[in-house]
């Protein structure tokens, strides 16, 4: 069954700046990735970025830089200042649409004992499976 993993990291240099990395482990051709915060996309969450493999990338504040890392993973850097900046317990969600297979979403937040600058494991909890 396809899996989506989400990794949230606080930057050591800017303590209110976050990097979100998401990846898809499954079959099909990724046709769209949606990154949101505050909950799942379409269920109270606010869209931060939409990445399309051909039509390009759209992002909204406080997203600073969204990019493809590989054909099946993305990263997003968030600005750390202003009223709309994330806090330590913010939930980030990534939804991958894979043609012609389906779409799957997983969410994650900063690990409770997160040491800024130290990266979490490549596929940290939580991983949400579509079982």
């Amino acid at each position: 069954t396809p899996e989506v993993w989400v990794q949230v990291r606080m930057e050591a240099t800017e303590l209110s700046s976050f990097t979100i990395r998401c990846g898809f482990l499954g079959s099909g051709s990724i046709s769209l990735v949606t990154v949101s915060w505050g909950g799942p996309n379409g269920a109270g969450g606010t869209t931060l970025a939409v990445l399309h493999p051909e039509r390009g990338i759209r992002q909204w504040a406080p997203a600073r830089q969204a990019r493809w890392e590989t054909q099946s993973s993305i990263s997003l850097i968030l600005e750390g200042s202003g009223a709309s900046s994330p806090c330590a317990n913010t939930t980030f969600c990534c939804k991958f649409a894979s043609f012609p297979e389906g779409s799957w979403e997983a969410c994650g937040s900063l690990p409770p004992s997160s040491d800024p600058g130290l990266s979490a494991p490549p596929t940290p909890a939580p991983i949400l499976r579509a079982d």
Partner: antibody, heavy 113, light 107 residues
Amino acid sequence: EVQLQQSGPVLVKPGASVKMSCKASGNTFNGYYVNWVKQSHGKSLEWIGLIDPSNGGTNYNQKFKDKATLTVDKSSTTAYMEFNSLTSEDSSVYYCAGGTVYWGQGTTLTVSS
Amino acid sequence: DIQMTQSPSSLSASLGERVSLTCRASQDIGNNLNWLQQEPDGTIKRLIYATSSLDSGVPKRFSGSRSGSDYSLTISSLESEDFVDYYCLQYASSPVTFGGGTKLEIK
């Protein structure tokens, strides 16, 4: 694992319409799109289109855009394909599939007067 | 639409033999190719996804590979239940298209 149960064989007259179903066991499609595929007797497979059960979004093969209508009933976790203006060319076996991995057993459609 | 040319359309082979089936794509599809198996009663099962990844529960005698625009399904040692139909499908772009199929027959 998603198990898909398709409706039984149907015999209809030319010009009529038919609606076949594809029921997901366990009350969930588990994120998978429902694809519909046509297999004419002794021939290869043709992709008709897909529907996203989560929001009803569709993607049709242009060849079948005016022939097929894909819908889903989330409450019963059942996908439907309606075929209209039937001719003998539509006599085939029709499969639904969860993505490309979980396949229904097929529904045989016979169009005959 | 992307055309998938599958060969041979039928193949006679013996138990224990190694066979390869091929699909050629009319344009670049990357690794976006799956292989399906269809039994005489119509049951369809996916064997390989993304050119070379084996689906769970599929015997290790099945493998997939690519050379340029040619994609192969290889069965290393044929068993009796392998003498059925096989199809490739590409999903690099919509619409999904299938190869014409290969009927594997026992010699």
